[in-house]
């Protein structure tokens, strides 16, 4: 008995060939011996089965001895053994129809779980193997679960259902709703304008929701809201902004915030949360601000940084075109009685300069 696997909603062709390449009488029946379709004279006739409105045959191939039955818009309950009667012989074809669907919306927030459920005919024992766009392989039976979706899980998932050495492939498009980056750090000299950008890792025709930037300044004892906003069809409108600092927000996507001046009291880390309409949960992006200040006071030249810096970062004071350098894995360095000239304060990570500030030391007579 031949086994054919089909996909729910698809079309399948069950073949039946006569030994002689000529038009002859044939019938397709189900396992209950109910006629589905056949030939009477030169005409296709249909029986009383539930399939009658979805079953057809290729008339153009009859004179080649090919009497296939085509079933459109397959349903799980179409799974059955079908019998083709032609030239006094019977050919049996077992059709197994499977469906694979996501249990929820296919637009899911990062960190949420994805469950794929296999619909299968009674008595079947299929196995399912899914491959994510990032190459992750997951296996399961009737259900496949991905507990925590990541950005890289966005795209087309390819799932293969296997039964009796036969396979059928499903493709499911999953959109993981997330920001492009989980975290970003902006390095600025004191007084410079700061630009924060929060690009999304997905595109939606209509994007509506609301959000907030919640900030923990390094020097502050508690965190606070810097700005709240609404998003209507990709248009941004500010709801409430703190008095200090007075942030500005772009009216279009990507979400874009401008801090007029980088000041030590603003250095710290923030969390931008975005809630999307009809979704429970929020998208998050962490943003850090590191601020550098170089000052000369009396005989002391000091360079300081504020904000979240890793312990492996190096802070240096260096006299331009001279070898004089003081370096520390600390948040402040200083030189007593510095030589006159242009001094550079550098914040670097393994030799790569992240931030630099120049200060001119004038000779004292």
């Amino acid at each position: 008995k031949k086994v054919v696997l089909g996909k729910k909603g698809d079309t399948v062709e069950l073949t039946c060939n006569a030994s002689q390449k000529k038009n002859t009488q044939f019938h397709w029946k189900n396992s209950n011996q109910i006629k589905i379709l056949g030939i009477q004279g030169l005409f296709l006739t249909k029986g009383p089965s539930k399939l009658s409105d979805r079953a057809d045959s290729r008339k153009s191939l009859w004179d080649q001895g090919c009497f296939s039955m085509i079933i459109k818009n397959l349903k799980i309950e179409d799974s059955d053994t079908y019998i083709c009667e032609v030239e006094n012989k019977k050919e049996e074809v077992e059709l197994l129809v499977f469906g694979l669907t996501a249990n929820s919306d296919t637009h899911l927030l990062e960190g949420q779980s994805l469950t794929l459920t296999l619909e299968s005919p009674p008595g079947s024992s299929p196995s399912v193997k899914c491959r994510s766009p990032g190459g992750k392989n997951i296996q399961g039976g009737r259900t496949i679960s991905v507990p925590q979706l990541e950005r890289q899980d966005s795209g087309t998932w390819t799932c293969t259902v296997s039964q009796d050495q036969k396979t059928v492939e499903f493709k499911i498009d999953i959109v993981v709703l997330a920001f492009q980056k989980a975290s970003s750090t902006v390095y600025k000299k004191e007084g410079e304008q700061v630009e924060f950008s929060f690009p999304l890792a997905f595109t939606l025709e209509k994007l509506t929701g609301s959000g907030e930037l919640w900030w923990q300044a390094e020097r502050a004892s508690s965190s606070k809201s810097w700005i709240t906003f609404d998003l209507k069809n990709k248009e941004v409108s500010v709801k409430r902004v703190t008095q200090d600092p007075k942030l500005q927000m772009g009216k279009k996507l990507p979400l874009h915030l401008t801090l007029p001046q980088a000041l030590p009291q603003y250095a710290g880390s923030g969390n931008l949360t975005l809630a999307l309409e009809a979704k429970t949960g929020k998208l998050h992006q962490e943003v850090n601000l590191v601020v550098m200040r170089a000052t000369q006071f009396q005989e002391n030249l000091t360079c300081e940084v504020w904000g979240p810096t890793s312990p492996k970062l190096t802070l240096s004071l260096k006299l331009e075109n001279k070898g004089a350098t003081v370096s520390k894995q600390a948040k402040a360095v200083w030189v007593l009685n510095p030589e006159a000239g242009m001094w550079q304060c550098l914040l670097s990570d393994s030799g790569q300069v992240l931030l630099e500030s120049n200060i001119k030391v004038v000779p004292t007579w």
Epitope: G209, E212, S225, T242, Q243, T273, A275, K282
Partner: antibody, heavy 119, light 107 residues
């Protein structure tokens, strides 16, 4: 520790006036919007008014507009509610609340002060 | 003004029960919704902000969901200290408005 403490409640005749005060501590008062919320005996919560950090914006529920005035003194870490032309339906426990929670939530509430308007 | 309608107005449950309270806004409020718990003679306490985020220090048995006009507060396993009145509140537009409250009582 964040604390908000209300005072000034009491018994007042209809048509009379009362001034409620709220003393805040444990946070930078001048950085937060503040609200007054009331609760009539055995009833639910009703937001009354709020005021921006530096006092430039004030909002009221319709039922108190023109009768109540919210104000603040950031130097004294204090919030006030001046209530004039009081009515029996203004009888309630009045809470001073910090609007400092994420997503504009009301995160710290005082213990409340009872205002009774009765002849 | 935006009307907030809570249901049911009261619910009886036993320790360990799952309790769900719904809140409906008369117009869309995105995720500008908070849930509060109030015990007799005490000030309200913030539980959930932004429709679904848990306030620091609040037990994880409390959860919030929804956006737009329909919101839900769920207590997954009722504890003795959870018997109280719960209020939803919108912060989408002035005046801020509260639901009428849902009293969770012992069965």
């Amino acid at each position: 520790e964040v604390q908000v403490v209300e005072s000034g409640g009491g018994l007042v005749q209809p048509g009379g006036s009362l001034r409620l005060s709220c003393a805040a501590s444990g946070f930078t008062f001048s950085s937060y919007w503040m609200s007054w919320v009331r609760q009539a005996p055995g009833k639910g919560l009703e937001w009354v008014a709020n005021i921006k950090e530096e006092g430039s914006e004030k909002y009221y529920v319709d039922s108190v507009k023109g009768r109540f005035t919210i104000s603040r003194d950031n130097a004294k870490n204090s919030l006030y509610l001046q209530m004039n032309s009081l009515r029996a339906e203004d009888t309630a426990v009045y809470y001073c609340v910090r609007e400092g929670g994420q997503w504009l939530a009301l995160d710290y509430w005082g213990q409340g002060t009872l205002v009774t308007v009765s002849s | 003004d935006i009307q907030m309608t809570q249901s049911p107005s009261s619910v009886s449950g036993s320790v360990g029960d799952r309790v769900t309270i719904t809140c409906r806004a008369s117009q869309g409020i995105s995720s500008w919704l908070a849930w509060y718990q109030q015990k007799p003679g005490k000030a309200p306490k913030l539980l959930i902000f932004g429709a679904s985020s848990l306030q620091s220090g609040v037990p994880s048995r409390f959860s919030g969901s929804g956006s737009g006009t329909d919101f839900t507060l769920t207590i997954s396993s009722l504890q003795p200290e959870d018997f109280a009145t719960y209020y939803c509140q919108q912060a989408n537009s002035f005046p801020w408005t509260f639901g009428q409250g849902t009293k969770v009582q012992i069965k």
